[in-house]
């Protein structure tokens, strides 16, 4: 009838409104978003869709082609004047490809019932959509009541006769979701109950979170969960040459968006991040740890000719302590201290100097004092020994001065002030020191210890002795004190520049006590211990020389 606006003007011929609709629709059909995977898109199927309509005079396929002569599968039905319409359109089996929640996007037009004269009682402005799950690709022969209703679909925009005249078509897009699905696939069905509909396209898809590289972790394509509020935790894998402390994870939302990243990967030592990948450090650059962002140039006095270096090699004569970080310059031992001066105070020496001109590039410079006692005649030096005290200390000196005490008086010393730093012990090179020669002041000599008796007569005793162990200067003279035993208050003093004397005017057969002390410019030393010798009796001969113990 004419009131259907040409819907049934000729069998197998598309009505005008469909043609107009398709021209408009084709301009609006865009590529699917990257997070949607199509299971069915009626617009892209080149051959027969394989859909079934029943009754046969219900839904019909309109064969159109696009500008490339590819078929456009459009189904229409417009039995608005007849009562009790129940027209079904069944799709072929659709695999869900493992998705548990799918979306159905319908593009369609719907005629406004008010614009159809005489059909108000029977005309409808909605249709129903159903689905049936099946593992069987040939399971379409099922009863209507086995289909599960998804929804009643109504048009947001319906068109009228006026729209047709103005060649304006109102294309509706409706999306519904179904889930959770438990079988391998499903069928969709569209039920018309008396509307004037053109089903322009059916797109069935699921959503995925598309594979992505984030924080150097690769997250695979992940199909979204069945529940619209569900977040799926997905583990990422680190890209080549990267490592992680905390395994990378992200959450895939029901809308196919990656959310809530946890953990990350880092380029391993010797590699740096560039454009989402880990690239090798080139020669001259290094990266010591994954936690460092990028490769850095070798520090001063070091180099690397390798790719993927985690540290750099020190140049010749430069060194790195184990405790030095790899980012620190290679360093060398310091040069010698400079401008050393000494100040002698009796048997103490104060040394002072200024730091080396070259610290070797280190801040940990300290000083070591080597003490040598030198024989001025032979020119031979020996270690000073343990009796010398160093204030504040002999080694590890941080200040540029030191005091040596308890030195021997009137002795030639050589002090070597050596500068050392953290790499001095790694260097095979010569020690770097400055020498200071000093002579300690004279002091009172030590006691005479070794006295020998010479010729003993009835009235005289001859003695000889050795210079004190520590003369502490030039011995100017000796003082010999002697008295008759038990007559200490009545003593005699003899002075001698030699190490021998003869005491005269003594009583025969009497015991005499002798004590000797030496004098230098600094004064007298203490008297020796007492030595006792006895004169001979009147009738006796002189005794032989012998050493008195």
């Amino acid at each position: 009838p004419a009131s259907l606006a040409g819907c049934y003007s000729a069998p197998r011929r598309a009505p005008l409104w469909t043609c107009l609709l398709l021209c408009a629709a084709l301009r609006t059909l865009l590529a699917s978003p990257s997070n949607e995977v199509n299971l069915l898109d009626s617009r892209t199927v080149m051959g027969d869709l394989g859909w079934i309509a029943f009754p046969k005079n219900g839904w019909e396929e309109i064969g159109e082609v696009d500008e490339n002569y590819a078929p456009i599968h459009t189904y229409q039905v417009c039995k608005v004047m007849e009562q009790n319409q129940n027209n079904w359109l069944l799709t072929s089996w659709i695999s869900n490809e493992g998705a548990s929640r799918i979306f159905i996007e319908l593009k369609f037009t719907l005629r406004d019932c008010n614009s159809l004269p005489g059909g108000l009682g029977t005309c409808k402005e909605t249709f129903n959509m159903y689905y049936f799950e099946s593992d069987d690709q040939n399971g379409r022969n099922i009863k209507e009541n086995q289909y599960i209703k998804i929804d009643t679909i109504a048009a947001d925009e319906s068109f009228t006769e006026l729209d047709l005249g103005d060649r304006v078509m109102k294309l509706n897009t409706e999306v519904r979701d179904v889930g959770p699905l438990s079988k391998k696939g499903f069928y969709l069905a569209f039920q018309d109950v008396g509307a004037c509909i053109a089903l322009v396209s059916v797109r069935v898809y699921y959503k995925k979170c598309p594979s992505v590289v984030r924080h150097l972790a690769v997250f695979p394509d992940t199909i979204t969960g069945a529940d619209s509020s569900q977040l799926l935790e997905v583990s990422g894998s680190c890209v080549n040459h990267s490592v992680t402390d905390e395994p990378p994870k992200m959450h895939c939302s029901a809308e196919g968006e990656w959310l809530v990243p946890i953990g990350k990967c880092m380029c391993k030592a010797g590699y740096e991040e560039k454009n989402g990948t880990c690239q090798v450090c080139r020669p001259g650059f290094f990266k010591a740890s994954p936690h460092i962002q990028s490769c850095g140039k070798c520090p001063p006095h070091s180099y690397t000719h390798e790719e993927a270096s985690t540290s750099c090699v020190c140049e010749k004569d430069y060194f790195r302590r184990e405790s030095d970080p790899p980012t620190m310059a290679c360093t060398r031992p310091p040069s010698a201290p400079r401008n050393a001066i000494s100040n002698v105070n009796e048997t103490s020496v104060f040394l002072e100097w200024i730091p080396p001109a070259d610290t070797g590039g280190r801040k940990d410079v300290s000083y070591y004092i080597a003490c040598k006692k030198c024989n001025s005649h032979a020119g031979v030096c020996e270690e000073c020994g343990g009796h010398v005290r160093y204030l504040p200390r002999q080694s590890g000196l941080k200040n540029t001065s030191v005091m040596m005490v308890d030195l021997l008086a009137h002795t030639n010393y050589t002090f070597e002030i050596e500068a050392v730093n953290g790499v001095s012990d790694l260097s095979p090179g010569a020690r770097q020191y400055v020498s200071v020669n000093v002579t300690t002041n004279q002091a009172a000599p030590s006691p005479v210890t070794n006295v020998k008796k010479g010729k003993i007569a009835k009235n005289s005793i001859s003695l000889s002795w050795q210079e004190p162990d520590r003369p502490n200067g030039i011995i100017l003279e000796y003082e010999i004190k002697y008295f008759e035993k038990d007559q200490e208050t009545s003593y005699t003093i003899i002075k001698s520049k030699e190490t021998t004397i003869t005491a005269e005017g003594l009583k025969p057969a009497s015991v005499y006590v002798f004590q000797i002390r030496a004098r230098t410019a600094a004064g007298y030393g203490v008297f020796s211990r007492r030595f006792e010798f006895e004169t001979t009796p009147v009738f006796a001969a002189s005794s032989d020389q012998s050493q008195i113990p």
Epitope: P283, K297, C298, Y303, H305, E306, E307, E315, K316
Partner: antibody, heavy 120, light 111 residues
Framework: EVQLVESGGGLVQPGGSLKLSCAAS????????IHWVRQAPGKGLEWVAS????????YYADSVKGRFTISRDNSKNTLYLQMNSLRAEDTAVYYC?????????????WGQGTLVTVSS | DIVMTQSPDSLAVSLGERATINCKSS??????????MNWYQQKPGKAPKLLIY???NLESGIPDRFSGSGSGTDFTLTISRLEPEDAAVYYC?????????FGQGTKLEIK
């Protein structure tokens, strides 16, 4: 004192093989990249190949790729260049040169060169 | 490969005068703020000698009358006061990218 001494050059027929050596002294050989550079008679310098100290990175000029092999024996402080399928255009003085230590590195020490003549 | 082109191919300069040699690379030889450009001197029958590394750094033991400048693709070697012993062939070389290509050389003669 740093020294590089090449040896092994000589006359060889086209298609033949030759192995050049470069003996190094005066530096820590194993930490230095070494290069081979050649110079055809009366011509300019042509970079041939390089090898890093640990032999982890090796590069060749396109003109010798697949025919020449650079290698080293750090225990002997010696660099090698194995030359196979020699052609007349490989005739040149071959120099070994040490990669420097001052960044960005140049070739700071060179050997005296060894002459390779490819002729029938 | 990066192609290095030197100019001029040869030049003659009087003693005490300034000599300038240019080198142009087919693409930038800079990386991370440094220019990977080296200059060498070669005398007849001798091995090349490194003069300048990193475009402008004077190699140890080289007289300071030699200097280098430039970045990116354009570089210059300058000898400020020519001495008799400076007569030689000079080569530029890039070490930014494998293969390490040389320029064709510039022959410097003393007038």
């Amino acid at each position: 004192e740093v020294q590089l001494v090449e040896s092994g050059g000589g006359l060889v027929q086209p298609g033949g093989s030759l192995k050049l050596s470069c003996a190094a002294s005066g530096f820590t050989f194993s930490t230095f990249g070494i290069h081979w550079v050649r110079q055809a008679p009366g011509k300019g310098l042509e970079w041939v190949a390089s090898i890093s100290g640990a032999s982890t990175t090796i590069y060749y000029a396109d003109s010798v790729k697949g025919r020449f092999t650079i290698s080293r024996d750090n225990s002997k402080n010696t660099l090698y260049l194995q030359m196979n399928s020699l052609r007349a255009e490989d005739t040149a003085v071959y120099y070994c040169a040490r990669y420097g230590t001052s960044f960005p590195y140049g070739l700071d020490y060179w050997g005296q060169g060894t002459l390779v003549t490819v002729s029938s | 490969d990066i192609v290095m082109t030197q100019s001029p191919d040869s030049l003659a300069v009087s003693l005490g005068e300034r000599a300038t040699i240019n080198c142009k690379s087919s693409q930038s030889v800079d990386y991370d703020g440094d220019s990977y450009m080296n200059w060498y001197q070669q005398k007849p029958g001798k091995a090349p000698k490194l003069l300048i590394y990193g475009a402008s750094n004077l190699e140890s033991g080289i007289p300071d009358r030699f200097s280098g400048s430039g970045s990116g693709t354009d570089f210059t070697l300058t000898i400020s006061r020519l001495e008799p012993e400076d007569a030689a062939v000079y080569y530029c070389q890039q070490s930014n990218e494998d293969p390490f290509t040389f320029g064709q050389g510039t022959k410097l003669e003393i007038k």
